[in-house]
């Protein structure tokens, strides 16, 4: 909707300026649990190698970041919270900061495009469902338009 | 693996040349069912409007195309096959052509990056799982590295 579009544009306008603050909030939250976990980590090899950074910077950047945020929120932090009652609230707070960051990144679409759904596709699906059986005929009868659109997409990718 | 990488590179090298053939195959397959479905479509308004083309060409292009291919393969074609016994094989053949196209697009990563998983993320997850409880400590203790990587990603996006 236009309203959403405007909100998204505003998010994008202010976002770069907010970036240092959001990262500072994340670092502050992490500083409260850092010692606890680093003391327990007895292995000097790295988990987050620079190959991950390379993927973040490459064509899979969005997926890599999205997956890593999900990995921390769904796999790492729920288990980390249970390591010690004193640490639980701080890990939770760190998770909330990470969720806030993800929300901001999602709002400004160009930062996490891979997590956004195409509105046009949603409209196609809604129209298709409303048409019931007639939707099958229409979707199939327009398949050559779909081929034209695929061609346009692929031509653009080749040019880029 | 390196082998896969080479295969992928080869796919990408030959892909642009194969594009017209793949689209021709799709159009040929569609021509065999076109009349059947267009005859049954009694509405002259469009389902696949150009807002979809715009999404294909925009930052959500990969997701939009990926979702639309899935929509046709999982929702439209299975129902279309059941419209008439004479048409079933032709619809099936059209679906196979679409699957082949998707497979080729996936193999040459830059065409459907949103469907590819980050290898680095997979390696992180594998290493994390192998470490069992120690993985929690390592993943949490390296969270500041993760923040640095996030910062690098966002800085790159702002610059772009």
């Amino acid at each position: 909707s236009p309203g959403q579009g405007t909100q998204s544009e505003n998010s994008c306008t202010h976002f770069p300026g907010n970036l240092p603050n959001m990262l500072r909030d994340l670092r502050d939250a992490f500083s409260r649990v850092k010692t606890f976990f680093q003391m327990k980590d007895q292995l000097d090899n790295l988990l987050l190698k620079e190959s991950l950074l390379e993927d973040f910077k490459g064509y899979l950047g969005c997926q890599a970041l999205s997956e890593m945020i999900q990995f921390y929120l769904e796999e790492v932090m729920p288990q980390a919270e249970n390591q010690d009652p004193d640490i639980k609230a701080h890990v939770n707070s760190l998770g909330e900061n990470l969720k806030t960051l993800r929300l901001r990144l999602r709002r400004c679409h160009r930062f996490l495009p891979c997590e956004n759904k195409s509105k046009a596709v949603e409209q196609v699906k809604n129209a298709f469902n409303k048409l019931q059986e007639k939707g099958i005929y229409k979707a199939m009868s327009e398949f050559d338009i779909f081929i034209n659109y695929i061609e346009a997409y692929m031509t653009m990718k080749i040019r880029n | 693996s390196p082998g896969q990488g080479t295969q992928s590179e080869n796919s990408c090298t030959h892909f642009p040349g194969n594009l017209p053939n793949m689209l021709r195959d799709l159009r040929d397959a569609f021509s065999r069912v076109k009349t059947f479905f267009q005859m049954k479509d009694q509405l002259d308004n469009l389902l696949l409007k150009e807002s979809l083309l715009e999404d294909f060409k925009g930052y959500l292009g990969c997701q939009a195309l990926s979702e639309m291919i899935q929509f046709y393969l999982e929702e439209v074609m299975p129902q279309a096959e059941n419209q008439d016994p004479d048409i079933k094989a032709h619809v099936n053949s059209l679906g196979e052509n679409l699957k082949t196209l998707r497979l080729r697009l996936r193999r040459c990563h830059r065409f459907l990056p949103c469907e590819n998983k980050s290898k680095a993320v997979e390696q992180v997850k594998n290493a994390f799982n192998k470490l069992q409880e120690k993985g929690i400590y390592k993943a949490m203790s390296e969270f500041d590295i993760f923040i640095n990587y996030i910062e690098a990603y966002m800085t790159m996006k702002i610059r772009n």
Partner: antibody, heavy 118, light 107 residues
Framework: EVQLVESGGGLVKPGGSLKLSCAAS????????MYWVRQTPEKRLEWVAT????????YYPDSVKGRFTISRDNAKNNLYLQMSSLKSEDTAMFYC???????????WGQGTLVTVSA | DIVMTQSHKFMSTSVGDRVSITCKAS??????VAWYQQKPGQSPKLLIY???TRHTGVPDRFTGSGSGTDYILTISSVQAEDLALYYC?????????FGGGTKLEIK
Amino acid sequence: EVQLVESGGGLVKPGGSLKLSCAASGFTFSDYYMYWVRQTPEKRLEWVATISDGGSYTYYPDSVKGRFTISRDNAKNNLYLQMSSLKSEDTAMFYCARGYYYGLFTYWGQGTLVTVSA
Amino acid sequence: DIVMTQSHKFMSTSVGDRVSITCKASQDVNTGVAWYQQKPGQSPKLLIYWASTRHTGVPDRFTGSGSGTDYILTISSVQAEDLALYYCQQHYSTPYTFGGGTKLEIK
């Protein structure tokens, strides 16, 4: 009710240019492919141009390719036909039509007359 | 280009008669044929498409048939208001082409 009203026709010299317009109402203009079809003084009908719903795709027969340009303004619900290098054989009644995307003309306007003569 | 031929330029009939207007394509158009009616001083109106599908609001005395290259528009019981020019058109492939028209005259 679907309404298509053409305008812009008139007398023009060979080699000249003319721009036709078609004002659409009674339907969601941006949901449809649109067309120009002409009818010669001998009453022969000829498809002249097609434009897709958003204007990204345009199609013409060889007889007008390179001379005629179809365009649309979805915000104004208007269809256009820019004609240049006009010839006497372009003399015709020009109709704007709505239809299926594969060249089936469901609704027609009343037409605007174009006469190309010295 | 596909050439659509309407062999009769004129057809004369009486009110209540059954009349068939024919159209031949230069190649198979796979039932991708439409019929239009143009009354004097008016623009063409779609009657039939896909050879046999009646357009919205078209009286059921108008029926279309045919396949391959041969197509027929039939008016089962001609009315005075059916005095008009009738065109066939192929919408099977570009360029879309029309027949020369058949003028239906009422005796």
